[in-house]
Structure formats: structure tokens, C-alpha cells
Amino acid sequence: VIHVTKEVKEVATLSCGHNVSVEELAQTRIYWQKEKKMVLTMMSGDMNIWPEYKNRTIFDITNNLSIVILALRPSDEGTYECVVLKYEKDAFKREHLAEVTLSVKADFPTPSISDFEIPTSNIRRIICSTSGGFPEPHLSWLENGEELNAINTTVSQDPETELYAVSSKLDFNMTTNHSFMCLIKYGHLRVNQTFNWNTTKQEHFPDN
């Protein structure tokens, strides 16, 4: 099994590892499937691409019957199977079988924290946000290891790219020192950013 790892939105080339001459195409059926669902077929020279892959998949017949998937999505991750059937006597016989595992990475960048003052009060508001990752993120605010209540946390997903964006607000009393951590967990991964507030100097600085 061949393993291919790519970043989301990148291009992945999955090779069948087999060549068929132009003359042989008329007597050949080629199936690309992903986890038992069809991606692409070429039957005696007629090509068909399934709707989920249309307009973003190229079949490169001259390059080992590879499929090239453009603008990778998280849902493209999985095991692809290429089957080549060759007409022999009175039937199509399996001539070649190959498996390619595609991993699609979609890491959230380190979140950014912005802050602003709420007029005529001792309350300051900070906003933590990041976008462009997968799977669905879970954001929490921590201070000294204790979880805090955010004002509101919004998670949205782009239907086209399948990538998530997350944003969360936290209000705090600016008359005391604070060190807040914005922690984002997604799948088995996590990213975080720390916001420090120092009352004596009336300043903040994020950890990098």
C-alpha cells in the first residue's frame, strides 16, 4: 500500500502503478474507488467522474493511470483502490490492483488573541480566533488550569472546503493580573495561545 500525505487545498497524485497503451484502452476497464465508492471509471475509452470529484479530478492515463485530485478536502482522506480489467477471450479479467492511502492534513494555525476596552467599566474583552483546520474544533479558556466561561464561542464550517473557523470572547476584570490560555482541540491535536495582562504597567503581551 502506497501512502500519500498532503495538506488541505493542495494537489494529490495517486498512482495506479500500471501503464496501458492507447491501443489497449479499447479493451480495458479502469476503476478508481474510494472505500467502495466509485471515483472514476474508464471503460473502453469512455471516462466518467463521479459528482463529488467532478471539476477537481484529472485522470492522467499517460502517468501510470494516476488520478490527480485538486483542492484537497478533508473528506478526500482514505484508501483508494485502482482496478484494471483487461479483456481476455470472452471476459474482462483483473490485470492489476493497487491501493493508495491518502492522508489530508488540515492544521489550525496558532490562534490570535486581540483585546479591546469596554468603555466606562473595568472590564476588558479578548477575542481568540483561528481558521482553516479540520476536524471540528473545541475551544476553551483556561486560567491557572481552571476552565473559564466564555461569553460566546462560534464554530463555522465552509461547505466548499469543509474547513472550520472558531472564535470566542472572554471578558475579564482589568484591575487584576491575568494569564489566560486559549486552547483549541481538534481530533488528537491542539493549538493554543496565551494572553497576559499586567495591571501595574497596564499592558498585555501574548506568548509566541
Epitope: 467502495k36 466509485m38 471509471t41 471503460m43 469512455d46 466518467n48 480489467l85 474482462f92
Partner: antibody, heavy 116, light 108 residues
């Protein structure tokens, strides 16, 4: 000589399920994709789907997804078609056929009648 | 999916008459992927013409097939009684595989 022997006629109640068999002679099913085709009374032919018996991969016409399930047992050299939640619309003759450039070999067909 | 439209749906021909059945395909396909089957009542379909113009084993030479792209036809040069049957065209260009609705040919 290639021959596809299908199981006998079935009379089944609405809502039930039925499993039809297709046992070839003259070839080993693991070397060929096996297809199923439906023909309702006085109607045309409808392709249901295929199975690659070697690895169990299947492909269905979307309109039969959830209704039909194609399986194969290479040890007994038999392909199966299971139909679930039967209604009068499923009353038909079901054929198995072997993949080729075209359907060169067909079973004799299994009539399925859905009736209360 | 690719839709195959056969015409006529029903026709009758006298012995010795020339018969043509057409099959119109909703999108262009390779001629090697268009096939014809003959079916008589209460029997399984039989392969009749494959790859547009090749006669299946045992098919009389009075039958012929032609066409390309989206337009295909089956022709009987001289109708005989045993030709009375239903004829179906079928495409193997893309999934789902599809058949025409059939042309019932009767003897006049």
C-alpha cells in the same frame, strides 16, 4: 461450458426480505464481476449492480441503494442478491449475468412475487 | 445517468421486409460500448449485437448494427418469423449501466 443456475421462484409478503442465488458452472466467480438485472412484468431491463467477488467491492445503481445487497461466497462459487422491505414494486424477474464486453451469459431468472 | 431512447416502441413487419430499430443515447459514447439484446417472452435476454456492429455467436447474418456518438441502429435486412421478439439496446460507457425501454417487433 458456461452456465448460470439461479434459485427458484419466490412468493413473499410485503415488508419481508428475500435472498436469491446464482451458481455458475464452467468458471470461478472470483475471476469475474457478477451483475444483477431486474425486469418487472411487461417492462424493460434495469441494472441493479455488480460485485467483485474477490474483494467484495460492490457498485449499485443509486435507485437500488438500500433496497438491494449483492454478496458472493467464493468457497461455494455463488453470488447472491438480497432484497429488503419488499413492496409490489419489487415483483419482477431477477437475472444474474457475468461481466464481459457485454452480458454474454445470463441466468434463467428468478421470479419474485410480492403479495399479501 | 445515460438515457437510451429506443424507437419505435412497437412495430410489426411482414416476412421479407427490412426492419430498422434506433437507439438514441443522451450523451456521446464510444461505439464499442453499445450493445443489443434479443428477448422472447418468458426467457432470458440473449446477446445479439455487441460493440455496435459485431454479431454475437449464432446470430443470423441478416442482422446488422451501425452508429456512432449518440445515434445507433439495429437492422434486419429481411424479416423472418423467428425474429419476432423484443430488442433492447444497452450502454457500457458509464455507471449506472442502462438499457433502452425496448422495441417489440411483431410479425405481420
Amino acid at each position: 461450458e458456461v452456465h448460470l443456475q439461479q434459485s427458484g421462484a419466490e412468493l413473499v409478503r410485503p415488508g419481508a426480505l428475500v435472498k436469491l442465488s446464482c451458481k455458475p458452472s464452467g468458471f470461478n466467480i472470483k475471476d469475474y464481476y457478477m451483475h444483477w438485472v431486474k425486469q418487472r412484468p411487461e417492462q424493460g431491463l434495469e441494472w441493479i449492480g455488480w460485485i467483485d467477488p474477490e474483494n467484495g467491492n460492490t457498485l449499485y445503481d443509486p435507485k437500488f441503494q438500500g433496497k438491494a445487497s449483492i454478496t458472493a461466497d467464493t468457497s461455494s462459487n455463488t453470488a447472491y442478491l438480497q432484497l429488503s422491505s419488499l413492496t409490489s414494486e419489487d415483483t419482477a424477474v431477477y437475472y444474474c449475468a457475468r461481466e464481459g464486453l457485454f452480458f454474454a451469459y445470463w441466468g434463467q431468472g428468478t421470479p419474485v412475487t410480492v403479495s399479501a | 445517468e445515460i438515457v437510451l431512447t429506443q424507437s419505435p416502441a412497437l412495430m410489426a413487419a411482414s416476412p421479407g421486409e427490412k426492419v430498422t430499430i434506433t437507439c438514441s443515447v443522451s450523451s456521446s459514447i464510444s461505439s464499442s460500448n453499445l450493445h443489443w439484446y434479443q428477448q422472447k417472452s418468458e426467457t432470458s435476454p440473449k446477446p445479439w449485437i455487441y460493440g455496435t456492429s459485431n454479431l454475437a455467436s449464432g446470430v443470423p447474418v441478416r442482422f446488422s448494427g451501425s452508429g456512432s456518438g449518440t445515434s445507433y441502429s439495429l437492422t434486419i435486412s429481411s424479416m423472418e418469423a423467428e425474429d419476432a421478439a423484443t430488442y433492447y439496446c444497452q450502454q457500457w460507457s458509464s455507471y449506472p449501466l442502462t438499457f433502452g425501454a425496448g422495441t417489440k417487433l411483431e410479425l405481420k
